[in-house]
Interface confidence: low
């Protein structure tokens, strides 16, 4: 090989050992019969050399550095050449370095021809092995702007006071052009400006200078995004850290087209803007850091550009100003991750602050819009607390558990609407009265409606799930001893059409000791299936529940249990069931941990079924399923 560097070219070539490998046989550069492991060639020198092995690319790397001095004379602007030409160089992993020094008042612009660049983070590598490492200078300090691969959106990087560009090419890569040019610009009065151009839909991940280390103190860095007017851009911060500021505040500023409040200033912890049409700028501003404990400022963010959806121009008003203790969350429904590019699905507050999920709280009116290709990718979950702290104020008061119409009008499916109903301990209890009688969901008779009410205890230490209930059954009311959560869960988009069937009223009533009482008024047409709370896990220890079952005068009720034995084994106490005729008060008592369950029995008058649990041994829980069927009386037994 022969390398000749012209005089005044300001080029230095360095061939040196690369990262050591476990190859047994060493390799040397052979020059004038000398064996060396490093060779430096300066401007004006001509050197002939060879290698002592057949695969020098496994041992050596070559660095070609060109110093460009714009301080003392005119700058060689324009397209940057690869000198010496790659065809004249040995086939080693090679790094071309251009080190441009300029006055602070001079702006330097690196322009990248297509394919543009894509920034990568620490630990990432480029698929083709071609990387661009770009750094700038603040006085004597080198600042890493970033490492970039091909096939991205970054088209230009502007800096001042100098720039160092390193192009790394693997030994096998055929590239023979630098792919960029240098131009001079007026002072940019900041560390750097990165221009990112989107031709169509796509995303770009970008990072602050020196990432993942700290952004230089009190510096300013700007990203300019060129976005076709028919597309929309959204910014989301993937990772950031704030330093300890002594003066000023770390922030990001946006220049957004059409905004009357430019620049729009955001804290890094704020939700960032979305649904922006056309070009915009984003700037990161550092602060004066505490000398003793500076901390670090760093930022990694993503810009997502996509087509606006029909919904993105619609504004929905969610009026929660008259609500309290309520939060509404719009979020992605769980899905399997797809590997291909999926357009973002965002919900936007005031059409500007967009994110993949959004929580609205009571006490205000909210204006929201959507930036999403498919709104079925989102759903809504709502929580509302109705609490009574003073039994004297709340006793006998009633509240309607209805999904507000503002929420039903949103174009996103409601998943859960949970009411947390809180009462003063041992002072008040609750009664739930449905607009339409409820059916308890069982394996034998599952609910097939578009929604159900899930009723569970809301006392943290108590694991008690009363069951899932849907309209169209025989349960007239449910009384519960203390705090519960009632969740309206939807199962089908048809809930919108069936919403009129929802309707549950809760009333605060005088305290009673039983965990739950179900009032059942069976219809003559169907069999009513009822089961104990906490099905599959067993009725909690020492818990008592009752069913008040009405039997019309002209009917007889058949009570049937679906097991021969309850299966419960008591560790302490007794588990028992009482079946009591309401008219005569006559009762039968069954020991559930000893006796067999009663055979089907016929009841001519309304009756109670009361089940009380012991403290069962683990694995031997109390689960009972029974049914009530009405048939016409053939003989009047009164």
């Amino acid at each position: 090989f022969e390398i000749a560097l012209p005089r005044e070219s300001n080029i230095t070539v360095l061939i040196k050992l690369g990262t050591p490998t476990l190859l047994a046989k060493p390799c040397y550069i052979v020059i004038s019969k000398r064996h060396i492991t490093m060779l430096s060639i300066k401007s004006g020198e001509r050197i002939v050399f060879t290698f002592s092995c057949q695969s020098p690319e496994n041992h050596f790397v070559i660095e070609i550095q060109k110093n460009i001095d714009c301080m003392s004379g005119p700058c060689p602007f324009g397209e940057v050449q690869l000198q010496p030409s790659t065809s004249l160089l040995p086939t080693l992993n090679r790094t071309f370095i251009w080190d441009v020094k300029a006055h602070k008042s001079i702006g330097l612009e690196l322009q990248f021809s297509i394919p543009r660049l894509r920034q990568i983070g620490p630990g990432e590598s480029c698929p083709d092995g071609v990387t661009h490492s770009i750094s700038g200078r603040i006085d004597a300090t080198v600042v890493r702007i970033g490492t970039f691969c091909s096939n991205g959106t970054v088209s230009r990087i502007k800096m001042q006071e100098g720039v160092k560009m390193a192009l790394h090419l693997p030994w096998f890569h055929p590239r023979n052009v630098s792919g960029f040019s240098i131009a001079n610009r007026s002072s940019i009065k900041r560390l750097c400006i990165i221009e990112s151009v989107f031709e169509g839909e796509g995303s770009a991940t970008l990072m602050s200078a020196n990432y993942p280390e700290g952004f230089p103190e009190d510096e300013l860095m700007t990203w300019q995004f060129v976005v076709p007017a028919h597309l929309r851009a959204s910014v989301s911060f993937l990772n950031f850290n704030l330093s300890n500021c002594e003066r000023k505040e770390e922030r990001v500023e946006y220049y957004i087209p059409g905004s009357t409040t430019n620049p729009e200033v955001f804290k890094l912890e704020d939700k960032q803007p979305g649904n922006m049409a056309g070009n915009f700028n984003l700037s990161l501003q550092g602060c004066d850091q505490d000398a003793q404990s500076p901390g670090i400022l760093r930022l990694q963010f993503q810009v997502l550009v996509q087509h606006p959806q029909n919904e993105s121009n619609k504004i929905y008003v969610v009026d929660l100003s008259n609500e309290r203790a309520m939060s509404l969350t719009i979020e992605p429904r769980p899905v399997k991750q797809s590997r291909k590019f999926v357009p973002g699905c965002f919900v936007c507050l005031e059409s500007r602050t967009c994110s993949s999920n959004l929580t609205l709280t009571s006490g205000s009116k909210h204006k929201i819009s959507f930036l999403c290709d498919d709104l079925t990718r989102l759903w809504m979950n709502v929580e509302k607390t109705i609490s009574c702290t003073d039994h004297r104020y709340c006793q006998r008061k009633s509240y309607s558990l209805q999904v507000p119409s503002d929420i039903l009008h949103l174009p996103v499916e409601l998943h859960d609407f949970s009411w947390k109903l809180l009462v003063p301990k041992d002072r008040l209890s609750l009664v739930l009265v449905p607009a339409q009688k409820l059916q308890q969901h069982t394996h034998e008779k599952p609910c097939n409606t578009s929604f159900s009410y899930l009723v569970a205890s809301a006392i943290p230490s108590q694991d008690l799930y009363f069951g899932s209930f849907c309209p169209g059954g025989s349960i007239k009311q449910i009384q519960v001893k203390q705090n519960i959560s009632v969740t309206l869960r939807t199962f089908a988009p048809s809930f919108q059409q069936e919403a009129s069937r929802q309707g549950l009223t809760v009333s605060f009533i005088p305290y009673f000791k039983e965990e739950g009482v179900f009032t059942v008024t069976p219809d003559t047409k169907s069999k009513v299936y009822l089961r104990t709370p906490n099905w599959d896990r067993g009725l909690p220890s020492l818990t008592s529940v009752s069913w008040n079952i009405s039997v019309p005068r002209d009917q007889v009720a058949c009570l049937t249990f679906f097991k021969e034995r309850s299966g419960v084994v008591c560790q302490t106490g007794r588990a028992f069931m009482i079946i009591q005729e309401q008219r005569t008060r006559a009762e039968e008592i069954f020991s559930l941990d000893e006796d067999v369950l009663p055979k089907p029995s016929f009841h001519h008058h309304s009756f109670w079924v009361n089940i009380s649990n012991c403290s069962p041994t683990s694995g031997k829980q109390l689960d009972l399923l029974f049914s009530v069927t009405l048939t016409p009386r053939t003989v009047d037994l009164t």
């Epitope: 309290r324 203790a325 006490g363 109705i386 609490s387 009574c388 702290t389 003073d390 004297r392 104020y393 709340c394 006998r396 008061k397 509240y399």
Partner: antibody
Framework: QVQLQQSGSELKKPGESVKLSCKAS????????MHWVRQAPGQGLKWMGW????????TYADDFKGRFVFSLDTSVSMAYLQISSLKSEDTAVYYC????????????WGQGTLVTVSS | EIVLTQSPATLSLSPGERATLSCRAS??????LHWYQQKPGQAPRLLIK???QSISGIPARFSGSGPGSDFTLTISSVEPEDFAVYYC?????????FGQGTKLEIK
């Protein structure tokens, strides 16, 4: 719009009685509770109690049990506060206010009635 | 009963300054706390409900924080019409109580 219109100022002698009225308009009286608040001259606000406008059941704070009576006439959307055996320390502005929700905040107030008790 | 202690008793500020009014409850009352403004010769006016919820028609410069036992009413930039007495009120349990008030006066 919602309004609570209170009766005019009263000048009374110790030992006499007075009945203050509060007329609710712009909403249905029975949908919200009615509370009474007292403010002595140059002093802060003191909650006297409330009346359940659905049932007519009153609740009094401890300092206002005995001589103070809350009542209603729902047919004319009126709430009343009667104070008997007036004392000089009853001199104050009395406000009626509408209670919202199950843990009330007072979103609308009457303009207040000044009761002066002086011999 | 819940005792509410407001501080300072008097706050002297110039228009444009930020006002921070404190209300401390004798025990935790969650967010069952409301703020009222009262001008001389007028009835109180509800400013903030449930510690931090804004009220329709009340300027956005009024904000509140909570829950717990320490509550704050903040006026981001005091306007001339904001000089008045401010009361906090507990709605946690009977009897409902008011703080003794903070007078915001012109400096």
């Amino acid at each position: 719009q919602v309004q609570l219109q209170q009766s005019g100022s009263e000048l009374k002698k110790p030992g006499e009685s007075v009945k203050l009225s509060c007329k609710a308009s712009g909403y249905t009286l029975t949908d919200f509770s009615m509370h009474w608040v007292r403010q002595a001259p140059g002093q802060g606000l003191k909650w006297m109690g409330w009346i359940n406008t659905e049932t007519g059941a009153p609740t009094y704070a401890d300092d206002f049990k005995g001589r103070f009576v809350f009542s209603l006439d729902t047919s004319v959307s009126m709430a009343y506060l009667q104070i008997s055996s007036l004392k000089s320390e009853d001199t104050a502005v009395y406000y009626c206010s509408r209670g919202r929700d199950y843990d009330p905040h007072f979103d609308y107030w009457g303009q207040g009635t000044l009761v002066t008790v002086s011999s | 009963e819940i005792v509410l202690t407001q501080s300072p008793a008097t706050l002297s500020l110039s228009p444009g300054e930020r006002a921070t009014l404190s209300c401390r409850a004798s025990q935790s009352i969650s967010d069952f706390l409301h703020w009222y403004q009262q001008k001389p010769g007028q009835a109180p006016r509800l400013l903030i409900k449930y510690a931090s919820q804004s009220i329709s028609g009340i300027p956005a410069r009024f904000s509140g924080s909570g829950p717990g036992s320490d509550f704050t009413l903040t006026i981001s930039s005091v306007e001339p019409e904001d000089f008045a007495v401010y009361y906090c009120q507990s709605a946690h349990s009977f009897p409902y109580t008011f703080g003794q008030g903070t007078k915001l006066e012109i400096k």
